[in-house]
Amino acid sequence: IPTEIPTSALVKETLALLSTHRTLLIANETLRIPVPVHKNHQLCTEEIFQGIGTLESQTVQGGTVERLFKNLSLIKKYIDGQKKKCGEERRRVNQFLDYLQEFLGVMNTEWIIES
Amino acid sequence: IPTEIPTSALVKETLALLSTHRTLLIANETLRIPVPVHKNHQLCTEEIFQGIGTLESQTVQGGTVERLFKNLSLIKKYIDGQKKKCGEERRRVNQFLDYLQEFLGVMNTEWIIES
């Protein structure tokens, strides 16, 4: 069992492994996986990890490619934990409105919005 | 029925209305609403809109506060539409890996990650 590494380091390592194993992963020419059509990635985590599951089931395991899928599974675990934290703390309306304002502000400035 | 306005303009208008009606909205001293504990807002859209629903049911309607909740409902509709687009297009592994790489890249640079 590997020593637990920070999620940020885990993401960096996973990006490197993804690059390393790209040729092996794309070997299946006929496989089709759902790909989101926009860049608001966080809205699509469920579909992204379903796609990863499909890819894993079609990939010959062994060596560091196993490490890649293990990492992706840990990233999923982290995101699932973040999703749990969406509704854990009950606060006054004031605080909810401040969060809502921040959410809309980020949507206004950072989301890729197509009308 | 109002002329459909671009989502970006809708978000801006909603931010202004939120500010205008803040005093009315916070009048309920004892109401508690779940507030996410992190800034990865897109992961929490479901909880945010549940909170908006709770707030709407506790707020005396009329005038432009109604417009605020109507706008928030249109924003929810837009986000639901974006979520639908997460799994509509099936693509080759190559394209899925590009999206995954971009997702992890954004996670690496833009997400607020607490280990």
């Epitope: 009950r90 004031n94 304002q101 | 004892t30």
Partner: antibody, heavy 117, light 109 residues
Framework: QVQLQESGPGLVKPSQTLSLTCTVS??????????WSWIRQHPGKGLEWIGY???????YYNPSLKSRVTISVDTSKNQFSLKLSSVTAADTAVYYC?????????WGQGTLVTVSS | SYVLTQPPSVSVAPGQTARITCGGN??????VYWYQQKPGQAPVLVVH???DRPSGIPERFSGSNSGNTATLTISRVEVGDEADYSC???????????FGGGTKLTVLG
């Protein structure tokens, strides 16, 4: 377990600006469920709320101090700060930083600031 | 702005019941929070949302709130309960925090 630690000079001259920083450990200052607050207590007196800030930068100040107070947040350092301008001897107090959910959950140990020439 | 009024001091013998009041206009419609502060220490929450106790706070501490008065009740008072007690509410019209002036609880004997 969230811990807060105030830091800054213990002595400030009249008419100058009092500056304090609160460092948060054991939790993120970007936690959407918390505000970050400053409270003070004059010697032998009750608690006086100074103001609070949200991670997004929204601030709320005590009306009696509003014209002199600035609270800011630095999410990269997990810190928030207090500046109180044009101080007088009446600003001599123990200054506390605290996390504020529905109530004040966690407090710093407090730092005594004396205003004197 | 909203004002909370507390008696400056309350004295009680060990084993007796202490009642500390906090007065405010229609305070019964607000949530009240009570803090205990011992000399040289930071305050500690002893009651939240009128009558709820945080974990670790003895059952001897209880609260009530109605009309224009909230009350912190400490039954079977112990010497270790000697401290300052402050009430706190939110002023929802401005979203400001309001503290009472504090009450010094003295345990006699």
């Amino acid at each position: 377990q969230v811990q807060l630690q105030e830091s800054g000079p213990g002595l400030v001259k009249p008419s100058q600006t009092l500056s304090l920083t609160c460092t948060v450990s054991g939790g993120s200052i970007s936690n959407g469920a918390y505000y970050w607050s400053w409270i003070r207590q004059h010697p032998g007196k009750g608690l006086e709320w100074i103001g609070y800030i949200y991670y997004s930068g929204s601030t709320y100040y005590n009306p009696s101090l509003k014209s002199r107070v600035t609270i800011s947040v630095d999410t990269s350092k997990n810190q928030f700060s207090l500046k109180l301008s044009s101080v007088t001897a009446a600003d001599t107090a123990v200054y506390y930083c605290a996390s504020l959910g529905n109530w004040f959950d966690y407090w710093g140990q407090g730092t005594l600031v004396t205003v004197s020439s | 702005s909203y004002v909370l009024t507390q008696p400056p001091s309350v004295s009680v013998a060990p084993g007796q019941t202490a009642r500390i009041t906090c007065g405010g206009n229609n305070i019964g419609s607000k949530n009240v929070y009570w803090y205990q502060q011992k000399p040289g220490q930071a305050p500690v929450l002893v009651v939240h949302d009128d009558s709820d106790r945080p974990s670790g706070i003895p059952e001897r501490f209880s609260g009530s709130n109605s009309g224009n008065t909230a009350t912190l009740t400490i039954s079977r008072v112990e010497v270790g309960d000697e401290a300052d007690y402050s009430c706190q509410v939110w002023d929802s019209s401005s979203d400001h925090v309001v503290f009472g002036g504090g009450t010094k609880l003295t345990v006699l004997g």
